[in-house]
Amino acid sequence: LPAQVAFTPYAPEPGSTCRLREYYDQTAQMCCSKCSPGQHAKVFCTKTSDTVCDSCEDSTYTQLWNWVPECLSCGSRCSSDQVETQACTREQNRICTCRPGWYCALSKQEGCRLCAPLRKCRPGFGVARPGTETSDVVCKPCAPGTFSNTTSSTDICRPHQICNVVAIPGNASMDAVCTSTSPTRSMAPGAVHLPQPVSTRSQHTQPTPEPSTAPSTSFLLPMGPSPPAEGSTGD
C-alpha cells in the first residue's frame, strides 16, 4: 500500500524535513504550508490549522514561497534619469535602469539607485576609457601631435594631418591646416569613435559643460559610508 499523504499541518517524522513549499513552524512544531509569491502569512499555523495567506497590498511584493508576516515594500519610483524595466507587482520588485547616455553610479541588488550622465570630453581632450553601464568616461588631454575638436563621450584624440607646407600648426583642439590642397597624409574624415556600450545622450537631456582649465592629478580614496537609505514609498 502507498504511504498515506499527510496534509498540513502535520508533525514530521523524527529526523525528516518538511516537503517542498512547506516550512517547519517552531511554535506549533508542525510542517505548515508556505504562502505563494504575491502573498504573505496573515495567520501562522497551529497544531490544528494551517497557515492563512493573504495577498500583498499595493506597492508591496513577495517573490518567493514564504511565510513572512508582511510583504516587502517595492523600491522608490524610478527617477527621471531612469527607465522602469520591471514594474512593481505583487510578485516582483520594481527595477530601474539608466536611460541611454547615462551610467549607473550607484548600483543596488537589482537595477540602479543613482544614474549619472556619461562625461563628455571637451575640445583638447579625448576619451581615454569609454563609459560602460557602471563606469563613467575617462578623459585625457590630447598629446602633442593629436587633437580633438569635439565635445563627446566617444571621440578619441586623432593625429594631426601631415602637411607638405603648414599654414596653421595644429594644437590639442584643432587639426593642422595645410597650404597645399592635398596633404601628404591625412586621417579619414569625421571623428574617430570608441566602442560605446551605452547609447549617446539625447540632445534635450545633455548637461551643459562649462569649460575651464586645471592641472590633472588623481589618487584613490578609501571607501566611505553609504548614501541615505532608499525610500520605500511606492506608487
Partner: nanobody, 124 residues
Framework: DVQLVESGGGLVHPGGSLRLSCAAS????????ATWARQPPGKGLEWIST????????TYADSVKGRFIISRDIAKNTVYLQMNNLKPEDTGMYVC?????????????????WGQGTQVTVSS
C-alpha cells in the same frame, strides 16, 4: 575617518535661495570629482550636478540648469551647491559624493564617499 558632511538645508519659500555645503574630512577633495544628488519624497535618487576635478568642468541636470551652481573651495576642502529661484519640486534630501576620476577600477559601480544628506524643503 573619511567622511563628507552636508549642511545648509532648511525650509525656504518658492523663489528663495539656499547654499549647501559639503565638507570633506580625512581626504583631500581637490583630486576628486564632486557630485550632488537629491532624493525627492517617495522617489529615487536624482543626479543634480558634477564638477570634474581635472578640468573644473561643471555639468547640470536640465531641471536645475541656470538656477544651481556647483563650486568648490580647495583651501576649505568643501564643495558648494548654490541654489537660486527654488521651486517646490526641488524639495528633497540632498547628498554629495566624492569620486576619483572615472570611478574605481576595484569598485566601478559605486561612488567613493557619501555624505548623509541635508533636507531641503521648498514650500509657501
Amino acid at each position: 575617518d573619511v567622511q563628507l558632511v552636508e549642511s545648509g538645508g532648511g525650509l525656504v519659500h518658492p523663489g528663495g535661495s539656499l547654499r549647501l555645503s559639503c565638507a570633506a574630512s580625512g581626504f583631500t577633495f581637490s583630486a576628486d570629482d564632486a557630485t550632488w544628488a537629491r532624493q525627492p519624497p517617495g522617489k529615487g535618487l536624482e543626479w543634480i550636478s558634477t564638477l570634474y576635478f581635472d578640468t573644473e568642468e561643471k555639468t547640470y541636470a536640465d531641471s536645475v540648469k541656470g538656477r544651481f551652481i556647483i563650486s568648490r573651495d580647495i583651501a576649505k576642502n568643501t564643495v558648494y551647491l548654490q541654489m537660486n529661484n527654488l521651486k517646490p519640486e526641488d524639495t528633497g534630501m540632498y547628498v554629495c559624493t566624492a569620486t576619483w576620476a572615472g570611478g574605481s577600477l576595484l569598485r566601478p559601480a559605486s561612488f567613493g564617499v557619501w555624505g548623509q544628506g541635508t533636507q531641503v524643503t521648498v514650500s509657501s
